[in-house]
Interface confidence: low
């Protein structure tokens, strides 16, 4: 019978040796077998698993001139870069005619140097701020024992005595680094290196010192920097729109917002060129020589509304015996608020001033007391808001009344003679 | 849930030795610390030494050099804590913590020596 | 060794009041530093570590605070299920030692 097609006769001559190294090396596992006619194909077998992608080579050398004589195979796998995966017992599978023969098994191993499957990373903290740092390392061979270093200093006496995949850090005030070695039978591997950069804590306690129409008077508290002076701190302020929905969390204003810095201490910082009656929202972030703090979260301000900032315009005063005609215009200058009304005053040369209250309409019509004989007659009209008076008009002379000239019809409005209170007259 | 269960009292002679186990569940075994701390009846806490579950290795405190012995089974989620020698004043609750700070405890073994 | 001194050693205390413990190291142990509390009968139970965190499940009114070699272990407003004896305990380094406890109980 052909050699190789008897169960109890192996065709192989030649089966896989063993392979133990570290990560990374390559090596080659080899098989030979004898058989007669035709040389089948020769599989690789891990753990008893075909291998579909193997990169095996296959030889085939035959021992005289016919086709029906005996051949030597030879199939060699390799193995480029040795990593876990690759451990387990090999062997090599042919089928001869109706039989499948199996070589005998060698065996690839991993031993080395521990390998990381994860290191330490670089990452930002705030000073005093607790934070965990990770790192994981294996064999074979197993153990492998855990050291951490910080600045260089191991944080436990021995390998496997101080914490272990997870460093939980109470708190740095210094920029600082951290590594960790892996130990085992072998030797010693060491992680990258992570800086550990300390910013400043987040400022507390943000709030408004004082408002005026278009400014505002901010302070906050200086978080823990560690060892490195607050250099600055940024103060942002954004139009609220009117509840445009910054929430406590949300990371970016709407709009581009009006930054400010301000030189530390004192921490504190008068944001100008407001605008008045208007909500605003405002946040802190201080910085030092290693970078900013976080950004506190958004307070809700509102300057405070202010007084019109002139007086009203185009005002006409027209007398007609005892009844005096006045109407104007809103200022034109910012009102800083809203509008409640305007007050007029007015007086003669030797009368007392009468002040009133118009409210908001834009014009009167006085019926003067006595015989309308005043010589020399004066108006004057300011605009106010809930935060006061703006600016009196300068005194407008009333103007005797001519024929032709409209008169419209108006509500009269009797004041009394002596005014409630005196005003003072621009 | 996160456990640590002890086995039970023991009454030991003078000279003898105690084994005391902690057998851990619902967290991975080999991922964190376990200590070993006693408190005598009336007095403080006083930590025994400590065990790294993943590669076996220990720390004692001097004043138990040579008279305790720490291990583990991996494959049971077990600690062990062995006391040989035994004296009246090794009278105590003896407790398994986990961790390097001791976020679980054991309920805790009593051992009385006693002649 | 690094030895750990806790006083007072007891402290009586009504429900409301604020009670402060304090533990001072002999050296100086950085912020590894735990707090336990224990019942009569039963295990410690963690909570205070690496000096000021609470730890998970603990009430807030319990806080800690100190670096270094001086540490405090504050009750904001004392509640009748924490009459039970303190501990303080360094984890700086081997072997770890434990405060001699405070024992705080109902005035």
């Known amino acids: 019978a052909p050699r190789g097609t008897q169960a109890e006769e192996s065709p192989f001559v030649g089966n896989p040796g063993n392979i133990t190294g570290a990560r990374g090396l390559t090596g080659t596992l080899r098989c030979q077998l004898q058989v007669q006619g035709e040389p089948p194909e020769v599989h690789w077998l891990r753990d008893g698993q075909i291998l579909e992608l193997a990169d095996s080579t296959q030889t085939q050398v035959p021992l005289g001139e016919d086709e029906q004589d005996d051949w030597i195979v030879v199939s060699q796998l390799r193995i480029t870069s040795l990593q876990l995966s690759d451990t387990g017992q090999y062997q090599c599978l042919v089928f001869l005619g109706h039989q499948t023969f199996v070589s005998q098994p060698g065996y690839v191993g991993l031993e080395g140097l521990p390998y990381f499957l994860e290191e330490p990373e670089d990452r930002t903290v705030a000073a005093n701020t607790p934070f965990n740092l990770s790192c994981q390392a294996q064999g074979p061979p197993e153990p492998v024992d855990l050291l951490w270093l910080q600045d260089a200093v191991p944080l436990a006496t021995a390998p496997g005595h101080g914490p272990q995949r997870s460093l939980h850090v109470p708190g740095l005030n210094k920029t600082s680094s951290f590594s960790c070695e892996a130990h085992n039978a072998k030797g010693v591997t060491t992680s990258r290196t992570a800086t550990i950069t300390v910013l400043p804590q987040q400022p507390r306690n943000l709030h408004l010192v004082s408002r005026q129409p278009t400014e505002l008077e901010v302070a906050w508290t200086p978080g823990l920097s560690g060892i490195y002076p607050l250099t600055h701190c940024t103060l942002q302020a954004v139009l609220s729109d009117d509840g445009m929905g910054i929430q406590a969390g949300e990371p970016d204003p709407p709009e581009e917002p009006l930054t400010s810095q301000a030189s530390v201490p004192p921490h504190q910082l008068r944001l100008g060129s407001l605008h008045p009656h208007t909500p605003y929202h405002i946040r802190v972030a201080c910085t030092s020589s290693q970078g900013p703090s976080s950004w506190t979260h958004w307070l809700p301000v509102e300057t405070p509304e202010g007084v019109p900032l002139g007086p009203p315009e185009n005002i006409s005063a027209t007398r007609n015996g005892s009844q005096a005609f006045v109407h104007w215009q809103e200022p034109r200058a910012p009102l800083q608020g809203t509008l409640l009304g305007y007050r007029l005053a007015y007086q003669g040369q030797d009368t007392p001033e009468v002040l009133m209250d118009i409210g908001l309409r834009q014009e009167v019509t006085l019926e003067l007391q006595g015989d309308g004989s005043v010589s020399n007659l004066t108006v004057c009209v300011a605009a106010y808001t809930a935060a006061g008076d703006g600016p009196w008009s300068l005194p407008v002379p009333l103007e005797a009344w001519r024929p032709g000239q409209a008169q419209p019809v108006h509500q009269l409005v009797k004041e009394p003679s002596t005014p409630a209170f005196s005003w003072p007259w621009w | 849930e996160v456990q640590l269960v002890q086995s039970g009292a023991e009454v030991k002679k003078p000279g003898a030795s105690v084994k005391v186990s902690c057998k851990a569940s619902?967290?991975?075994?080999?991922?964190?610390?376990m200590h070993w701390v006693r408190q005598a009846p009336g007095q403080g806490l006083e930590w025994m030494g400590i065990?790294?579950?993943?590669?076996?290795?220990?720390s004692y405190a001097q004043k138990f050099q040579g008279r305790v012995t720490m291990t583990r089974d991996t494959s049971t989620s077990t600690v062990y804590m062995e006391l040989s020698s035994l004296r009246s004043e090794d009278s105590a609750v003896y407790y398994c913590?986990?961790?390097?700070?001791?976020?679980?405890w054991g309920a805790g073994t009593t051992v009385t020596v006693s002649a | 060794n690094i030895q750990m001194t806790q006083s007072p050693s007891s402290v009586s205390a009504s429900v409301g009041d604020r009670v402060t413990i304090t533990c001072r190291a002999s050296?100086?142990?950085?912020?590894?530093l735990a707090w336990y509390q224990q019942k009569p009968g039963k295990a410690p139970k963690l909570l205070i570590y690496?000096?000021?965190s609470l730890q998970s499940g603990v009430p807030s009114r319990f806080s800690g605070s100190g670096s270094g070699t001086d540490f405090t272990l504050t009750i904001s407003s004392l509640q009748p299920e924490d009459f039970a004896t303190y501990y303080c305990?360094?984890?700086?380094?081997?072997?770890?030692?434990f405060g001699g406890g405070t024992k705080v109980e109902i005035k």
């Open positions: 619902g967290y991975t075994f080999t991922s964190y610390y």
């Open positions: 050296q100086g142990i950085s912020s590894w």
């Open positions: 305990q360094q984890a700086n380094s081997f072997p770890f030692t």
């Open positions: 690496a000096a000021s």
């Open positions: 913590a986990r961790d390097w700070y001791f976020d679980v």
């Open positions: 065990i790294n579950p993943s590669g076996g290795s220990t």
